[in-house]
């Protein structure tokens, strides 16, 4: 594809974080809820 | 993520010279990577761009001056063939495909003799 | 070769002021709006503002607001501060993975 670093956009950078972040936040859900019910 | 210049010094004109930018928090496989550089009180000046750590492109003053190529998961060499004083500058490099949103700070090689 | 040309090269204006600062590419950029803007500080790498023609960065103030397409853009920047004196640059992507920088303008605060 003959325009292939514009693949490598800001906005798809920023989606990509907030999918980190919202992962981030349920896995740290997940493990303080386990850690709780022990 | 950020990404980190490394490299620069004095070095005499037609010394080859090889500049190093390493990154982390991200995969160079998925990333454009572009080398920018900036004179003493000049303007920025983009040179080329790395896209996947596969394809290079250069502007076209930069052909057959500049190399850049993926030599590790988390490095992109600079290598500048032939240095003339008119290279002297501060390099960065950056993250993004036209659009770059992850800068260094930069790392300054003088061509003198 | 694309050439971006910035104007003006300089521009000097009050706290509270407003500075417009316009981008001219010699042809279209890719998708009519692959035109970034950056602001840099003596001794500092660029910061990046604006991203595809009009869209603000994470963390940047909507007092920056970047307008244009195809091959005419502009930077204003309303209710100037006294940290917005820096210089500002444009840069423009094209077909063919090619990417070019405008010449800069100083913006002065008085």
């Known amino acids: 594809h003959s325009d292939g670093i514009f693949t490598d956009s800001y906005s798809r950078y920023r989606k990509q974080m907030a999918v980190k972040k919202y992962l981030a936040a349920v896995l740290g859900k997940r493990y303080k809820q386990r850690v709780k019910n022990k | 993520q950020s990404v980190e210049e490394s490299g620069g010094r004095l070095v005499t004109p037609g010394t080859p010279l090889t500049l190093t930018c390493t990154v982390s928090?991200?995969?160079?496989?998925?990333?454009?990577l572009s080398w920018v550089r900036q004179a003493p009180g000049k303007g920025l000046e983009w040179i080329g761009i790395?896209?996947?750590?596969?394809?290079s492109y250069y502007a076209s003053w930069a052909k057959g001056r500049f190399t850049i190529s993926k030599t590790s998961s988390t490095t992109v060499d600079l290598k500048v063939t032939s240095p003339t004083t008119e290279d002297t500058a501060t390099y960065f490099c950056?993250?993004?495909?036209?659009?770059?949103?992850?800068w260094g700070q930069g790392t300054l090689v003088t061509v003198s003799s | 070769a694309q050439v971006l040309t910035q104007t003006p090269s300089s521009v000097s204006a009050a706290v509270g002021g407003t500075v417009t600062i316009n981008c001219q590419s010699s042809?279209?950029?890719?998708?009519?709006?692959?035109l970034s803007w950056y602001q840099q500080k003596p001794g500092q790498p660029p910061k990046f503002l604006i991203y595809q023609a009009s869209n603000l960065a994470s963390g940047v103030p909507s007092r920056f607001k970047g307008s244009g397409s195809g091959t005419q853009f502009t930077l204003t920047i309303s209710d100037l501060e006294c940290d917005d004196a820096a210089t500002y640059y444009c840069a423009g992507g094209y077909s063919g993975n090619i990417v070019g920088f405008g010449g800069g303008t100083e913006v002065v605060v008085k």
């Open positions: 928090g991200f995969s160079l496989s998925s990333a454009a």
């Open positions: 042809k279209s950029v890719y998708n009519n709006n692959w």
């Open positions: 950056a993250r993004g495909g036209g659009e770059f949103f992850i």
């Open positions: 790395i896209d996947k750590g596969v394809m």
